[in-house]
């Protein structure tokens, strides 16, 4: 007789994830040899025992520990970049920016970048046909505290001027409820961080309006300036040329606003 | 100078077996994740399996899951794959490739698998 | 799987000729692309990692760009040397997948 299997309103596990781990852990190792030390076996052992065998709506930060502790690494607190809700155009500039870092170019956050994952109580069972949705099922899924995890670990460990890439395009272009929002904003720690800088990408050609006076930029500023960090913002009207000018600094177009 | 040498192609009958060698050279074989690809006659490239460094990972593509084994003797530098249950479907040219940083920078010359009755 | 459309499947040009390939990716891979390229009864050999890095060895002419889904490998000045098959590779998901290849005929 089969065994009942929870149906969640998630998609399920990545095909081949425990491949693409490690396949990830191993290539992050050979590009970055300050990294050479970590056993990448090992840090998929932590991964997996950080959700294996777990009811998937019961997971903690404590589960995630040895794996945080595996993938321990030291980034230029001075050169972080946080996103909302523009990951791309946020990897895309710190891969021409290579003294910038963004989450996912740390070992933790490449590893599971775009990845879902989920696991059976009591059971060894990797779950491939649905995970917990955050909002339909449970919050503290595996892939939810993952990110909180290190997101919280990321914003703690930045010093000086941190700046976040905000999408102008979004309703809310800053959501409180975002991991942005929620998270990072609240584990900035205002004894090293001087300064928030938000660069507001602008998504019309034609869109010339100035986003930081926008209501959720003001919220935003508001709770930065509460937690005694100062707070500064840019609009950055031409993402294109953005990208391009940080390719090619010294083109002539590149004085002119972006 | 790195070099990848495989060996053990030929003629087989469709549900036969055959074993193929990849002797590597130039480099720690034991460092780095080899990988199996394949092209059939006039195809494009088709990934086949790769086994890490250490050699407790070992990963197939779905077409060949069950039939095929890749293993490594880091005593002799050398990746094998057994090929069980060959179908007419396996005829290809097969390639020992290793990896770094996520391209297969070295690849051997390829050695002619045809199953055929 | 990500699947990966390369076009054009073929093209004709010639010597000095500027040419361009492009890679389309199913779903977003950041910059986890490679370009190869495959004479006839050659294995292939690797020119792009990284989606813009260039292998040593590797005539300056070839260069990658591209991040997200769209890809682009590009020859500067088309040498009667690079008539070949050009297939690019991500390794963003596993298993890592081809594209189905560019032939390249020089005019």
């Known amino acids: 007789v089969p065994r009942w299997r929870q149906q969640w309103s998630g998609p399920g596990t990545t095909k081949r994830f425990p491949e693409t781990v490690l396949a990830r852990c191993v290539k992050y190792t050979e590009i970055h040899p300050e990294m050479r030390h970590v056993d990448c076996q090992s840090v998929w052992d932590a991964f997996k025992g950080a959700f294996i065998s777990k009811h998937p709506c019961n997971i903690t930060e404590e589960d995630y520990q040895p794996l945080m502790k595996l993938g321990t690494q030291t980034v230029p607190c001075n050169k972080i970049l946080l996103w909302s809700r523009i990951k791309d155009l946020a990897h895309q500039f710190t891969q021409v920016q290579r003294d910038m870092f963004t989450l996912e170019d740390t070992l933790l956050g490449y590893l599971a970048d775009d990845l879902t994952w989920c696991g059976e109580f009591n059971t060894s069972k990797i779950n491939y046909q649905s995970c917990p949705d955050w909002r339909k099922d449970c919050s503290n899924n595996p892939v939810s505290v993952f990110w909180k995890t290190v997101s919280r670990r990321f914003a703690e460990a930045a010093c000086d001027v941190v700046h976040v890439m905000l999408n102008g395009s979004r309703s809310k272009i800053f959501d409180k409820n975002s991991t942005f929002g929620s998270v990072e904003v609240h584990n900035l720690q205002p004894e090293k961080v001087q300064t928030l800088e938000a660069w507001v990408i602008h998504g019309g050609r034609e869109d010339s309006r100035d986003l930081c006076q926008d209501p959720t930029i003001k919220e935003l500023e508001s709770i930065i300036s509460k937690r005694n960090i100062q707070f500064s913002c840019k609009n950055i009207y031409r993402p294109d040329k953005f990208l391009q000018c940080v390719k090619n600094p010294e083109d002539s177009s590149c004085t002119s606003e972006i | 100078q790195v070099q990848l040498v495989e060996s053990g192609g030929g003629v087989v009958q469709p549900g036969r077996s055959l074993r193929l060698s990849c002797a590597a050279s130039g480099f720690t074989f034991s460092s780095y994740g080899m990988h199996w690809v394949r092209q059939a006659p006039g195809k494009g490239l088709e990934w086949v399996a790769v086994i890490w460094y250490d050699g407790s990972n070992k990963y197939y593509a779905d077409s060949v899951k069950g039939r095929f084994t890749i293993s490594g003797d880091n005593s002799k530098n050398t990746l094998y794959l057994q090929m069980n249950s060959l179908r007419a479907e396996d005829t290809a040219v097969y390639y020992c490739?290793?990896?770094?940083?996520?391209?297969?920078?070295?690849w051997g010359q390829g050695t002619l698998v045809t199953v055929s009755s | 799987a990500i699947q990966m459309t390369q076009s054009p499947s073929s093209l004709s040009a010639s010597v000095g000729d500027r040419v361009t390939i492009t890679c389309r990716a199913s779903q977003g891979i950041r910059n986890d692309l490679g370009w190869y390229q495959q004479k006839p009864g050659k294995a292939p050999k690797l020119l792009i990692y990284a989606a813009s890095s260039l292998q040593s060895g590797v005539p300056s002419r070839f260069s990658g760009s591209g991040s997200g889904t769209d890809f682009t490998l590009t020859i500067s000045g088309l040498q009667p040397e690079d008539s070949a098959t050009y297939y690019c590779l991500q390794d963003y998901i596993y298993y890592p997948t081809f594209g189905q290849g560019t032939k390249v005929e020089i005019k």
């Open positions: 490739a290793r990896m770094f940083r996520g391209a297969f920078d070295y």
